[in-house]
């Protein structure tokens, strides 16, 4: 018969290294008689026999953790007791080894230039992973502005435009490497004016181009203000290259003004704005008020080609610096305004505007422009374009056109000479000739004047509405 023998642990527990989700086994070989009861603890807490995460075999001498989790880290002890002598204990550590894992990856960031940006990158792993960052395709170098914090996050002080780009963090230990997804750092820059418009002192009727260049991220928008209001006339051309917006406001100068360029861009819910102003003053301002002088020459332009008599001499007003060009731009601008009017009104208005801006001319010693006959002007105003004229006058009264009224250089009919008084003193508009009885065929025209003022124009066999002279080339 065997003699009773107190338990002796013949193979003390050792430190076990295990990867997450792998199996880890502690062996606790015991010699004793009678057979001991062996219990196991983790961090001094008893492991229950029915805990399905563990398997205890060989009379309790083998403890197997079936699928290691990172929380299984700790000190494991086996305690053997058979009632003979005292209980004996042996302990060993479980070190859960873990490939790097990024638990809080970086996210896309928009940041305003000059501020501080932090891109998070929290990691897990055993051994503790080292964290580095990649920008684009290259490893990111730390410097006085750029640092990788203990937590793994990337901190950039005083963010610059060149910091913009795609970043990813890299967590590395002896077991492997983990990469975050690419994230985008967008650096936003407040709108700033690079080139302010220049002030000009020009002659009446000159063309001036005001140029304003601004930079910012996002690319700013540029708007122009004339004497405190949105610019009512002129053409604006914009181009964008390399985040720089170049805006050119071309003006036909008939009055002095203060023009302000406003560059604006948006950062989240906030806007940043930069402004620059220039004055346009008119040299010899009184010149335009005097009786205009000019010269007679053939019309070489395009807009009124189909309207003006082919070989007629027209008057060019030398109060403009380049009369031919100035008058052509005026008519071109007016022509565009006419795109919205009715088919009945448009050819009549075109004939009126062209003959008003390019008046027939008698060369003589003093070149003399011949204005349109009052009756033809009234025909356009009160018959062909009655609705449009009333609408335009209404807008003018409500101040909708402000200084932009010159875009439609319409004559004041009442100030024009009558062809009944002196037929040689004014120009007829042949396109508007129509049979007197045709007047009654225009419904819904309400004249603002007595019917006696409706022109008595010469009868003609051609109907205004179908004259081929109105087709535009």
């Amino acid at each position: 018969e065997k003699l009773p023998k107190a338990p002796v642990i013949t193979t003390p527990l050792e430190t076990v290294d295990a990867l997450v989700e792998e199996v880890a086994t502690f062996m606790c070989a015991v010699e004793s008689y009678p057979q001991p009861e062996i219990s196991w603890t983790r961090n001094k807490i008893l492991i229950k026999l029915f805990d399905t995460r563990y398997s205890i075999r060989e009379n309790g001498q083998l403890l197997t953790i079936l699928s290691v989790e990172d929380s299984d880290d700790g000190i494991y002890c086996c305690i053997a007791n058979n009632g003979v002598g005292g209980a004996v204990e042996s302990c060993g550590a479980l070190q859960v080894k873990m490939k790097p894992k990024i638990t809080r990856p970086p996210i896309n960031v928009k940041i305003i230039e000059g501020l501080k940006a932090v891109l998070p990158c929290t990691t897990m792993g055993n051994p503790k992973p080292s964290v580095s960052w990649i920008k684009g395709d290259n490893a990111l170098r730390e410097n006085s502005r750029i640092a990788v914090l203990e937590s793994g996050s990337l901190r950039i002080h005083n963010v610059q435009k060149e910091d913009a780009g795609q970043y990813r963090c890299v967590a590395k230990n002896s077991l492997g490497t983990a990469y975050s997804k690419l994230v985008k750092l967008e650096v936003e820059v407040f709108a700033r004016i690079l080139r302010a418009p220049e002030s000009h002192n020009v002659t009446f009727g000159s063309f001036v181009t005001l140029r304003c260049t601004a930079i910012g991220i996002p690319v700013p928008t540029i708007s122009w203000i004339e004497n405190g209001n949105a610019v009512s006339s002129g053409s604006i051309q914009e181009s964008v290259k390399d985040r720089v917006i170049d805006s050119r406001l071309q003006l036909f100068i008939t009055k002095p003004g203060l023009y302000t360029c406003i560059a604006t861009n948006k950062h989240g819910e906030k806007f940043s704005t930069a402004k620059a102003a220039a004055t346009v003053s008119i040299a010899e301002w009184s010149k335009s008020q005097k009786d205009s002088q000019g010269y007679c020459a053939q019309y070489r332009g395009e807009v009124c080609d189909a309207v003006l008599a082919k070989d007629a001499l027209v008057f060019f007003n030398t109060s403009y610096r380049d009369p031919e060009d100035a008058q052509e731009l005026l008519i071109h601008t007016a022509w565009n305004e006419l795109k919205a009017v009715s088919p009945l009104c448009r050819p009549a208005a075109e004939a009126l505007l062209c003959n008003h801006l390019f008046q027939e001319c008698s060369p003589g010693v003093v070149p003399t422009p011949m204005p349109i006959c009052r009756e033809y002007c009234l025909a356009v105003k009160e018959l062909f374009c009655a609705k449009e004229w009333q609408a335009m006058e209404g807008k003018a009264h409500r101040g909708l056109y402000r200084s932009g009224m010159h875009l439609l250089p319409v004559p004041e009919c009442s100030k024009l000479p009558s062809m009944h008084r002196d037929p040689t003193a004014c120009t007829r508009l042949p396109y508007l000739d129509y049979k007197k009885e045709n007047i009654t065929t225009f419904p819904s025209i309400t004249s603002s004047r007595p019917s006696a003022d409706i022109p008595n124009l010469p009868a003609s066999t051609s109907s205004f509405a179908v004259s081929p002279a109105y087709s535009m080339t």
Partner: antibody, heavy 121, light 112 residues
Framework: ELQLVESGGGLVQPGGSLRLSCAAS????????MSWVRQAPGKGLEWVSA????????YYKESVKGRFTISRDNAKKTLYLQMNSLKSEDTAVYYC??????????????WGQGTLVTVSS | QAVVTQEPSLSVSPGGTVTLTCGLS?????????PDWYQQTPGQAPRGLIY???SRHSGVPSRFSGSISGNKAALTITGAQSEDEADYYC????????????FGGGTKLTVL
């Protein structure tokens, strides 16, 4: 600095086609009319075609009408001359020239250095 | 089609005055032809001198002046200099059914 640079010239057989380009820089291209003018070797200047600032009309010398097409791309600051059904008498240096104003006709105040077109079999 | 006529060649002494003319084979040159004048030196592109009868292009010396004299356009060089030796072309705007621009045959100016 204002510059007009022509390209696209070369040797072509009678009946063939060429497209000349004129790249403009140093001025607001779409504020000016443009023209093509040619000069046969040892001869004088000959106006070929003109186009106003907005490309709204086109004008041609009678002998090239129906064969040549002038056009412009204001966004690209470029003037073009498409020449089809070329004849030996079209052999010349082709100059691109800028008008002093918007309309198609009038004084030419800036010229390119020209591109040579040779029509020969 | 009207032909624009110019003297084939002219000569002038340095410091002298010379007038080049530009006429039409049929009819007179008027301000409605907007006479323009161009200068071309060998191997170079033309250069604008005078536009619309009498206006000088920027950078053109004041010794060059334009006018209409009788039924012709005229370019006068007062105080000719050796660098003025060149070919001179006039250009006229023409309207006869369609718009046109016509150059004269050119005048070869020699400064002796």
């Amino acid at each position: 600095e204002l510059q007009l640079v022509e390209s696209g010239g070369g040797l072509v057989q009678p009946g063939g086609s060429l497209r000349l380009s004129c790249a403009a820089s140093g001025f607001t291209f779409d504020d000016y009319g443009m023209s093509w003018v040619r000069q046969a070797p040892g001869k004088g200047l000959e106006w070929v075609s003109a186009i106003p600032w907005n490309g709204g009309s086109t004008y041609y010398k009678e002998s090239v009408k129906g064969r040549f097409t002038i056009s412009r791309d204001n966004a690209k600051k470029t003037l073009y001359l498409q020449m089809n059904s070329l004849k030996s008498e079209d052999t010349a240096v082709y100059y691109c020239a800028k008008r002093s104003g918007r309309i198609a006709f009038g004084a030419l105040d800036a010229w390119g250095q020209g591109t040579l077109v040779t029509v020969s079999s | 089609q009207a032909v624009v006529t110019q003297e084939p060649s002219l000569s002038v002494s340095p410091g002298g005055t010379v007038t080049l003319t530009c006429g039409l084979s049929s009819g007179s040159v008027t301000s409605s032809n907007y006479p323009d004048w161009y200068q071309q030196t060998p191997g170079q592109a033309p250069r604008g001198l005078i536009y619309s009868t009498d206006s000088r292009h920027s950078g053109v010396p004041s010794r060059f002046s334009g006018s209409i004299s009788g039924n012709k356009a005229a370019l006068t060089i007062t105080g000719a200099q050796s660098e003025d030796e060149a070919d001179y072309y006039c250009g006229l705007y023409m309207y006869s059914g369609s718009k046109n621009y016509v150059f004269g045959g050119g005048t070869k100016l020699t400064v002796l």
